[in-house]
């Protein structure tokens, strides 16, 4: 018996087609992805093959103005239109709190939404009961298939799930649910979830009875053969894990941003064992036409976005200096504003010992692309912010050793004075440079804001300590020459859309007046 699994993950609000790098589509003839193009390919496969499931492994939420404006209603609407069979909850589905998940998505989705390791307690338990499920069994042709969901247990540190949801260890939570499916005589089981490739592989290895793992969160690109675009494969598709009980378990992921449609064919024997698995992600490029009816619907929904981008978010009473003459040479107040917004967006009261789980921010000055003039009545719009942060990136959470941070700050000024983009703007950090010293030895003082304290204060960076830092995904991926971050990071979790972080902060503060306050000094 053969099953075709079509899968997406980490789509992050890319409802419209995008450029090859998943930013805003500029040249339509070379654009990729988007729900209209995805629908064309899905329908083509549904018509050609008998047993097809369309699955999403989480993080539909967050990433473009679509989410900022529609807050998840767009996800439910277009996933319903594409007739998804199931979705697993990702960490970003909690970005607007539990209410921001329940109302627009859980109550409106016509497909099951899954997570076995999220347990509701307190007053939320009855409110959310049945709106998401640990597993779902679906009839597919003349067989039944069980799909069991999971979500990153780090979600409380990455999003805003509140205090009434407990995120359990994925493997511990999955096993009893898979066992339950076995008692229902369901012998073909897919684990669909959002915890990252390393956890996906562990699930394949450790959870008895799971036949296939469809994952997300780590934006992993797997491919067998010559890859069709710029993404470099992290391994073959599917990635085969040998389970502790000796089975070969295929593990798949489909990069991110709706650029690819994962396509996996699984052959089962009559006892539900996987006999063979093969496939590849399908690049959704312009050779695949956009479905006209979905495209028309997208255009209809777009109207509200255009109106939103010119509305006032808040006011500034000072000039927001985002000029390259400032931000690539010295502390600039636009950099301070952005870093403050980044930290504010990551406020999660961890426990009594910590005032927050993260206190530091770094931001490449070259990523700040425009100032904002306060003399236009002080008005700040989404459109203004899009000029400052035009790349559609995210502000991510990483864990780094102090020694890696020190290298990053040395890199920040290794060729100072050439207006290059690697000069770092900061938050929760005090740095002093001595440019008279040779490159690689210019950082003379590096103090960081404590987190394990009731009154935050600055202490010297410790080389062997592990620190959490908020930074642009561009830096996490080694951009602007920050190879040491990419090579040495200990953990990387993708965060919220950059413009959204800053716009939310400005809306919250209403009036802003960021200063240059001695975060970066030269001796």
């Amino acid at each position: 018996w053969e099953l075709t699994i079509l899968h997406t993950n980490d789509v992050h609000s890319r409802l419209e087609q995008t450029s090859e790098d998943s930013s805003k589509c500029v040249n339509a003839s070379r654009c990729m992805g988007g729900v209209a193009r995805l629908f064309t390919k899905v329908q083509q496969i549904r018509r050609a093959e008998p047993n097809v499931l369309l699955l999403d492994a989480g993080d539909q939420y967050q990433g473009t103005i679509w989410f900022t404006v529609y807050k998840g209603a767009e996800v439910a609407h277009f996933m319903n239109a594409l007739r998804y069979d199931a979705m697993a909850l990702g960490n970003h589905e909690f970005d607007n709190g539990v209410e921001g998940l329940i109302e627009p998505l859980l109550k409106e989705a016509k497909f099951p939404i899954l997570s076995a390791n999220i347990k509701a307690k307190g007053p939320l338990a009855s409110q959310i009961s049945g709106l998401y499920l640990p597993y779902k069994v679906l009839p597919v042709g003349d067989e039944v298939v069980g799909i069991v969901g999971y979500t990153s247990k780090e979600t409380p540190f990455l999003s805003n799930p509140g205090t009434n949801l407990v995120f359990e260890d994925e493997i511990t939570a999955l096993q009893p649910e898979v066992d339950k499916l076995k008692t229902l005589n369901v012998n073909k089981i897919i684990a669909l979830g959002h915890s990252g490739f390393e956890t996906d592989k562990l699930i394949a290895q450790k959870v008895r009875g799971v036949d296939v793992v469809v994952g997300g969160h780590s934006n992993t690109f797997l491919y067998t053969g010559n890859p069709p675009s710029k993404e470099v494969p992290a391994g073959k598709y599917p990635f085969i894990v040998t389970s502790d009980d000796g089975r070969k378990v295929p593990v798949v992921q489909a990069y991110a941003f709706g650029k690819y449609l994962g396509y996996l064919k699984i052959e089962f024997d009559e006892r539900g064992n996987v006999i063979s698995s093969h496939g590849n992600p399908i690049l959704l490029n312009s050779s695949i036409p956009e479905d006209p009816s979905i495209k028309a619907d997208i255009n209809k929904w777009r109207i509200k976005l255009d109106n939103y981008s010119t509305q006032e978010l808040g006011k500034t009473i000072v000039y927001l200096d985002g000029s390259s003459q400032s931000c690539r040479f010295r502390e600039c107040n636009m950099g301070n504003l952005i870093c403050d917004a980044m930290i504010n967006n990551n406020l999660r009261h961890a426990d009594e010992m910590f005032w927050n789980h993260v206190s530091m921010c770094i931001l490449n000055g070259g990523g700040i692309r425009s100032p904002i003039d306060e003399r236009n009545n002080g008005t700040i719009t989404w459109e203004n912010l899009a000029a400052v942060l035009p790349f559609g990136g995210t502000f991510d959470l990483v864990q780094l050793k102090g020694s890696t941070l020190k290298k990053a700050f040395e890199h920040s000024v290794h060729r100072y004075g050439q207006s290059t983009g690697e000069f770092l703007q900061v938050g929760g950090i005090h740095v002093v440079y001595d440019l008279s010293r040779k490159p690689g030895d210019r950082v003379v003082k590096l103090d960081v804001l404590c987190t394990k304290c009731r009154v935050p204060s600055y202490d010297p960076l410790k080389m062997d300590e592990i620190y959490k830092v908020i930074l642009p995904n561009f830096l996490a991926n080694g951009g602007d020459g920050f190879q040491m971050i990419k090579d040495e990071l200990l953990r990387h979790d993708s965060g919220d859309q950059d413009i959204n972080v800053v716009s939310t902060y400005i809306s919250k503060m209403k009036v802003i007046y960021p200063a240059v306050e001695g975060r970066i000094k030269f001796s």
């Epitope: 069979d85 049945g130 069994v137 009839p139 005589n185 009559e270």
Partner: antibody
Amino acid sequence: QVQLQQSGAGLVKPGASVKLSCKASGYTFTNYWMHWVKQRPGQGLEWIGMIHPNSGSTNNNEKFKNKATLTVDKSSNTAYMQLSSLTSEDSAVYYCARFFFGGYPHYYALDYWGQGTSVTVSS
Amino acid sequence: DIVMTQSQKFMSTTVGDRVSITCKASQNVGTAVAWYQQKPGQSPKLLIYSASDRYTGVPDRLTGSGSGTDFTLTISNVQSEDLADYFCQQYSSFPLFTFGSGTKLVIQ
């Protein structure tokens, strides 16, 4: 038209087994799941399990796991349910019913039912 | 397991009236509910699926509504042939199906 013809009523002794049949006509037997449902006198309906004639794949209500065995004979378009170790609790009318599903969101329902087979367990 | 509760065992009505039969699920089942009619001495017949979709040939006097945990089968302009037992069924927990205990419609 679609018809599900069930075998006649039966009187069986406690501890014995009985095999009920359900012959399908008017549609492609191997395209639809077949379900079995129990109804005790004056009581509600209780779902027993289902089988797909094409693959022979079965799913049972845990309660009936050791009680009911579902099989099919594709050549005669017939579904069978064997009930074993019968007690008075098993005295009931048993229905076979065709399962249809489709659409979006996925809907499932039992659209055609047999006339029922009455089983009486008595010594 | 999901329990479907039909709290009214009997409902009395008269010809031409409108009657509502209710069914409550023990947890959210979305719209994964079907309704069946069983006349005396007959096998059940499908009336409604997906909580509100009328099955082929079912008169539009019969209407299903509800979602989540509360579901209603409404019969308007009740006729003598509507005398029957009515059962709700949830299929949210597929492959486990559970039926309500039934409501007998009595026509005075």
